[in-house]
């Protein structure tokens, strides 16, 4: 029953977890306008991984994609890339997990297979987890040298008669749900990891041992016993737990055109 | 066609308060912010503050907070201004002022302060 | 808050001129974030609501003559009529789009001579 928790929770858990990866990769606030030399901007930037936005006065927020490969710092490229990678492994992961639920039954798969599957995916998640945990990490870093960099140079030009700041970008919300994200499926495929454990037959089963009673032929031969799971192989009358395995949709919500500075 | 359809010309004597509207059409409301602006008479414009149609957010030229009160009824497509404390400075045109660029401007309300 | 400043206050011409007035900011109004100026010019005449000309410094309007245009970049920008028209005797405001409070300029009166 534990394992079949374990394995449920891992799953939920890692299903979240990967819908905050998608809409981390989706959306426009990876990096927002450091508001600290102007908190009374009219024109308000962010960008985000595929294109950057500008909301002006007007309430109007016009956004343009990069509509170019080679000419994106290698940096971003790098972040994109393991984001993908992370929702591409996730996804399998989410696959093949389905699969190995322990509440869901599939034909006369062997509970070795499941056991197989569920750490295969509990691999996918962790790995998954880790790329956009890298990816998040990699972009805030990289704003963080741009931050301190547009500072050293903040008032240039004109020597120094005309005011010109330059705009600086600093941590914006897809950072923290990338980060939540990552954590969640990470920890989901630690979680399947350890219910794979559970699920794995252990290699020496019990002999059959014959038992005589005085006054009685009798023999009991109990079937092999898997440690832990609490049923014997020869264990007819399993529980199958329809619906056990629940899809959580998390609403990732964007921030709107019309929330303003 | 968008357009802007402010209320009439208003006479008042020092201290009262006056509430204007700005009807809009032609546009979904809750698109653009919608910003005031007044003209004193011969004078350059001065912009007063503007709100958000969609969350009712506002955001005031530091000049008139305390003056004026922006506010929206997002079923009749409706912004409203109150202006309390009247003087005699405050004699002007308040224009309300919305769409890209600040582009579509109403015809603009007359407010007279005369005791 | 930004300052806006026009030069001349106003002008006499006479129709077929080419004009030129400035408007110069106490700070930039140049956005790196989409490489614009906000920066925007409105016409007015009298008893009227002001008319948007150009929006990020030099953009036209749709539907406002081509004889109109606007240059300039950071804190210095000029509106230029290439050809004044009887219909163009009116009052020219420039305007920061960029910070709150959005401010205009005194406004350049152009007249007939």
């Known amino acids: 029953m534990a394992v079949t928790a374990c394995q449920g929770l891992g799953f939920v858990v890692s299903l979240i977890g990967i819908a905050g990866i998608i809409a981390a990769t989706c959306m426009d606030q990876w990096s927002t306008q450091d508001l600290y030399n102007n908190p009374v901007t009219a024109v308000f930037n962010y960008q985000g991984l595929w294109r950057s936005c500008v909301r002006e006065s007007s309430g109007f927020t016009e956004c343009r994609g990069y509509f170019t490969l080679l000419g994106l710092p290698a940096m971003l490229q790098a972040v994109r890339a393991l984001m993908i990678v992370g929702i591409v492994l996730g996804a399998i992961g989410l696959l093949v997990s389905i699969f190995a639920l322990k509440c869901i039954r599939i034909g006369s798969m062997e509970d070795s297979a499941k056991a197989n599957m569920t750490l295969t995916s509990g691999i996918m998640f962790i790995v998954s987890g880790l790329c956009a945990i890298a990816g998040v990490s990699v972009f805030a870093n990289m704003l963080v040298t741009n931050f301190w960099m547009s500072t050293a140079n903040m008032y240039t030009g004109m020597g120094g008669m005309v005011q010109t700041v330059q705009t600086r970008y600093t941590f914006g919300a897809a950072l923290f749900v990338g980060w939540v994200a990552g954590g969640l499926t990470l920890i989901g495929g630690v979680m399947m990891c350890i219910a794979c454990r559970g699920l794995a037959p252990e290699e020496t089963n019990y002999k059959a041992v014959s038992y005589h009673a005085s006054g009685h032929s009798v023999a009991y031969k109990p079937g092999g016993f898997k440690a832990s799971t609490g049923f014997g192989s020869n264990t007819k009358n399993k529980k199958i737990y329809d619906g056990g395995a629940r899809t959580e949709d998390e609403v990732q919500s964007y921030p709107s055109k019309h929330d303003y500075v | 066609e968008v357009q802007l359809v402010q209320s009439g010309a208003e006479v008042k004597k020092p201290g009262a308060s006056v509430k204007m509207s700005c009807k809009a059409s032609g546009y979904t409301f809750t698109d653009y912010n919608m910003h005031w602006v007044r003209q004193a008479p011969g004078k350059s414009l001065e912009w007063i503050g503007y709100i958000n149609p969609n969350n009712g957010g506002t955001s005031y030229n530091q000049k008139f907070k305390g003056k004026a009160t922006l506010t929206v009824n997002k079923s009749s497509s409706t912004a409203y201004m109150e202006l309390s404390s009247l003087r005699s400075e405050d004699t002007a045109v308040y224009y309300c002022?919305?769409?890209?660029?600040?582009?579509?401007w109403g015809q603009g309300t007359t407010v007279t302060v005369s005791s | 808050d930004i300052v806006m400043t026009q030069s001349p206050s106003s002008l006499s011409v006479s129709v077929g001129d080419r004009v030129t007035m400035t408007c110069k900011s106490s700070q930039s109004l140049f956005n790196s974030g989409n490489q614009k100026n906000y920066l925007t010019w409105y016409q007015q005449k009298p008893g009227k609501a002001p008319k948007l000309l150009i929006y990020?410094?030099?953009t036209r309007e749709s539907g406002v003559p081509d004889r109109f245009s606007g240059s300039g970049s950071g804190t210095d920008f000029t509106l230029t009529i290439s050809s004044v028209q009887p219909e163009d005797f009116a009052t020219y405001f420039c305007?920061?789009?960029?910070?709150?409070?959005?401010?205009f300029g005194g406004g350049t009166k152009l007249e007939i001579k």
């Open positions: 990020w410094a030099s």
């Open positions: 002022v919305t769409t890209r660029y600040l582009a579509v």
């Open positions: 305007q920061n789009d960029y910070s709150y409070p959005l401010t």
